[in-house]
Interface confidence: medium
Amino acid sequence: AGLKLMGAPVKLTVSQGQPVKLNCSVEGMEEPDIQWVKDGAVVQNLDQLYIPVSEQHWIGFLSLKSVERSDAGRYWCQVEDGGETEISQPVWLTLVPRGSSAHHHHHHHHSAWSHPQFEK
């Protein structure tokens, strides 16, 4: 499977209290079960959501409603394919104090799924 955390590898800087949505792209699998991992521990994420780009290309989401200090860290996504676990490159999520302006740096892809999406 081709596995890609959108915008990775990159450092994301987010204002404390803001929501963040990470997107993970999986190609070459019909029904990927995407797991999200933070600092080596699986993030339990019931009702995980997906968008089908095509039959063999899926986008999975990790939504954080309101990021706090405990959410800072290294995130990646992973899938099991043929008994092997494939992992994406990571994103480093860092925080700035509430009200500060956050600059989130990422690679410049021009598609709807180009980088971790931020929602107000």
Partner: antibody
Framework: EVQLVQSGADVKKPGASLTISCQAS????????ISWVRQKPGKGLEWMGA????????YYGPSFQGHVTISADRSTATAYLQWRSLEASDTAMYYC??????????????????WGPGTLVPVSS | SYELTQPPSVSVSPGQTARITCSGD??????AYWYQQKSGQAPVLVIY???KRVSGIPERFSGSSSGTMATLTISGAQVEDEADYYC???????????FGGGTKLTVL
């Protein structure tokens, strides 16, 4: 049209085993999670557990862990809720619910939007 | 285990604003969802992700969330809004769901 068709259940005695089913149609079964929700007579909703899109992961609420088993058969688009040993306190309406899964865009209205009609499980000696 | 707390009942006159609250320690981090259940029927989702109204639900229904409290507001409650309302969210570690105890809304 999304439909969740639930099986019926006869009166069961305490200690009996039981499996109830929820057959999905009108959508691709493996695009969504299925959850189960209990409602005792005259009482509120209780989240029991859920099974992931491809059946590889199950979650259970603390009150239900070890007492029920959630499973699914992708080939028949059917989810199951199973008891090895029923108790009188299991008497309730049980709903299966399509939850999570696919989204058509940035917003996510699919959470718990499609409910089965419920299966009434009476347990009495 | 994690709990969401709702008032057992709320009463308003037709045309008044009804507010139903839901309190839970994880609500600063987890979204709230609101369901309406009329007698003898399966529940219906009205609000998701704290404040987003489901298509087809009247505009008088709105949701908000601040800190550990989520609120369902019905502006100009109608007699047909009489029902039980439940909030739903996830436990803080995200590995199980929880419904609040439910609030019976009476519009008289």
């Amino acid at each position: 049209e999304v439909q969740l068709v639930q099986s019926g259940a006869d009166v069961k005695k305490p200690g009996a085993s039981l499996t109830i089913s929820c057959q999905a149609s009108g959508y691709t079964f493996t695009d969504y999670w299925i959850s189960w929700v209990r409602q005792k007579p005259g009482k509120g909703l209780e989240w029991m557990g859920a099974i992931s899109r491809n059946g590889s992961t199950t979650y259970y609420g603390p009150s239900f862990q070890g007492h029920v088993t959630i499973s699914a058969d992708r080939s028949t688009a059917t989810a199951y809720l199973q008891w090895r040993s029923l108790e009188a306190s299991d008497t309730a309406m049980y709903y299966c619910v399509r939850s999570g899964g696919l989204t058509s865009g940035g917003t996510i209205p699919e959470y718990y939007q499609h409910w089965g009609p419920g299966t009434l499980v009476p347990v009495s000696s | 285990s994690y709990e969401l707390t709702q008032p057992p009942s709320v009463s308003v006159s037709p045309g008044q604003t009804a507010r139903i609250t839901c309190s839970g320690d994880a609500l600063p981090k987890k979204y709230a969802y609101w369901y309406q259940q009329k007698s003898g029927q399966a529940p219906v989702l009205v609000i998701y992700e704290d404040k987003k109204r489901v298509s087809g639900i009247p505009e008088r229904f709105s949701g908000s969330s601040s800190g550990t409290m989520a609120t369902l507001t019905i502006s100009g409650a109608q007699v047909e809004d009489e029902a039980d309302y439940y909030c739903y969210s996830l436990a803080v570690d995200g590995n199980y769901g929880v419904f609040g105890g439910g609030t019976k809304l009476t519009v008289l």
